[in-house]
Interface confidence: medium
């Protein structure tokens, strides 16, 4: 047993042009609240699947009224933590869904109007008992900054909250006539001794002598920032100089999906999954009812009688999406092996194989690498009827015989220092900068100013961007 805790630090317009001035519609004032939903595992789950680990709702925030011609202020947030108790073992891997809802307070026919402003979905690994993990996420034109952690409660301990402690003063036997006690461990308040040198801040252990890393850190002693880190598991004011990495720019950067649409990367492009009521490449078309014919590809539209009612598209076989706008992509399962090109012909799938491979799914290797050798620990890669070497870090050239320095091109901006290590290069950024190449300036009030355990927000405190 334990509790998952989420602290919202700020919610507001993201950087860049086109950011909304106000969360409220033109109909009057509004206020915000947040819903957190936890689902087990890292797999993609249907949007309708329940929050099997639990869900929680914040209080409603203070009333916000847009001031014409005034700069958009920070949005007033609800106070305190969102807490989701979990009854069973903490799974370690989970999906975190944070929704920002608004309540419109103008005159509403039939009671308050509730609408979703933004939804953030993150799949995460997190050990119970670890430090606060931080994240900054964009949803449409909005930006959400938050911290979260999982901690055990009652007598539970361990990274999954599954081991039970007996308080040292407790008797060791069950009372007469009672069933046998659950197995308890004596003196389990004393943590196991981790491997010598294991990072106290970024590593942990459940068994003596091991060293397991929090997300964002790697290496035998959890001292190396992982190249895929999203600044999770960092504490204190030094996060801007720890070499914390932010994923490089991708098709979903820059908020291409409007109106709370969620962006997913596709090869060389992006795809927006739009909330109901919006469609278009970037979810830019809104105010839609069945009268507008929003269901594509022969989808059947079902909606309410009044103009404010939402609609549902019932899609014919072969199509999906809130507006039946997406053809079911059987190639997304990547049935063609070894880099083969997948073609969905409607009646069948076909794989167009790269040179050196054959078979219905390109599964047969014509063995370009036979008798070839790559020096200095490089590995031979089949393809194109010829071999290619994938070289170990620090080597290059056709056969990996030439030394290469990944830091030679000075990839770290703004005075950042470059370090080469086994999984790539790492930039240790100068104070005031962050990002995988130190390309992003930290906001003046910066993430680095966060305390180790963010305090609850007190009524009347001005909410500042981090």
């Amino acid at each position: 047993a334990g509790v998952f805790e989420l602290q919202i630090h700020s919610f507001g317009p993201g950087p860049g042009p086109g950011a909304p001035r106000s969360p409220c519609s033109a109909r009057g004032p509004c206020r915000l609240f947040f819903r957190v939903c936890l689902k087990p595992g890292l797999s993609e789950e249907a949007a309708e699947s329940p929050c099997a680990l639990g869900a929680a709702l914040s209080a409603r925030g203070p009333v916000y009224t847009e001031q014409p011609e005034a700069p958009a202020p920070d949005l007033p947030l609800p106070n305190g933590l969102l807490q989701v108790p979990f009854r069973d073992a903490w799974p370690g891997t989970f999906s975190l869904i944070i929704e920002t809802w608004r309540e419109e307070l103008g005159d509403q026919i039939g009671g308050p109007a509730w609408s979703l402003l933004a939804r953030v979905t993150r799949r995460r690994r997190l050990a119970a008992g670890g430090p606060w993990a931080r994240d900054i996420q964009r949803a449409g034109a909005w930006e959400l900054r938050f911290s979260y952690r999982a901690r055990c409660e009652l007598l539970a301990v361990g990274t999954a909250c599954t081991r039970l402690c007996r308080p040292r003063s407790a008797p060791s036997r069950c009372g007469p006539g009672l069933r046998p006690c659950a197995p308890l461990e004596d003196e389990c308040e004393a943590p196991p001794v981790c491997r010598a040198g294991c990072s106290l801040e970024h590593g942990f252990c459940e068994q003596p002598g091991e060293c397991r890393c929090l997300e964002g850190w790697t290496g035998p002693l959890c001292t190396v920032p992982a190249s895929t880190s999203s600044c999770l598991g960092l504490r204190g004011p030094s996060s801007a100089t720890t070499g914390c990495l932010v994923p490089g720019p991708g098709p979903c950067d820059g908020n291409p999906c409007a109106n709370g649409g969620s962006c997913s990367e596709t090869p060389g492009s992006f795809e927006c999954t739009c909330p109901r009521g919006f469609y278009g490449l970037r979810c830019e078309v809104s105010g839609v009812t069945c009268a507008d014919g929003p269901c594509f590809n022969g989808g059947l539209c079902v909606g309410g009688a009044d103009p404010d009612s939402a609609y549902i598209c019932h899609c014919p076989p072969g199509f999906q999406g809130s507006n039946c706008e997406k053809r079911v992509d059987r190639c997304s399962l990547q049935p063609c092996r070894n880099g083969g090109l997948c073609l969905d012909l409607g009646h069948a799938l076909r794989c167009r194989c790269r040179a050196g491979f054959a078979g219905p799914r390109c599964e047969h290797n014509l063995d370009d690498c036979a008798g070839r050798a790559c020096a200095n620990g490089g590995t031979c890669v089949e393809g194109g009827g010829a071999h290619r070497c994938s070289c170990a870090l620090g080597f290059g050239g056709r056969d990996c015989r030439e030394r290469a320095d990944p830091c030679a091109a000075r990839p770290c901006a703004h005075g950042g220092r470059c370090y080469a290590h086994f999984s790539g290069l790492v930039c240790a950024c100068a104070p005031g900068y962050m990002g995988s190449r130190c390309e992003f300036p930290v906001h003046p009030d910066g993430v680095s100013a966060l305390p180790a355990a963010p305090p609850g927000l007190r009524p009347g405190d001005p909410q500042r961007y981090l």
Epitope: F33, R35, C37, A47, E48, S49, P50, C51, A52, G54, A55, A56, L57, R60, P112, A113, W114, S115, L116, R119, N259, G260, S262, T273, C274, P275, R276, G277, F278, V302, G303, G304, D308, S309, A310, I312, S322
Partner: nanobody
Framework: EVQLVESGGGSVQAGGSLRLSCAAS????????MGWFRQAPGKEREGVAA????????HYADSVKGRFTISQDNAKNTVYLQMNSLKPEDTAMYYC?????????????????????WGQGTQVTVSS
Amino acid sequence: EVQLVESGGGSVQAGGSLRLSCAASVYTSSSYCMGWFRQAPGKEREGVAAMCFGGLVTHYADSVKGRFTISQDNAKNTVYLQMNSLKPEDTAMYYCAADFGRDKNYLRPLLPHAYNYWGQGTQVTVSS
């Protein structure tokens, strides 16, 4: 798969009371809304009462306001409908429904098409 099982229906005299229960196979606190609907013979299914966001918002149809109360016990994953001062026109099959979200951006808790999981129903008969 989410399963909803209703119970508590039956026959009662006008002015009497019944309490319907809806047991869910998953956390009811996970839902956007849990609702009660009814369908009389030859009529369309209509919304009776709904509770959204674990009780932050409740909605009632005008015809039952002041007589029916919806409540939720998250520990038991059960939603209740307390029906007082029953009238013959309340006679119908009563259904429990759960809305676990479809990437929606609105709440319309008394519209049947907003819900994606339904129970089998329990019959309520009110005689005069």
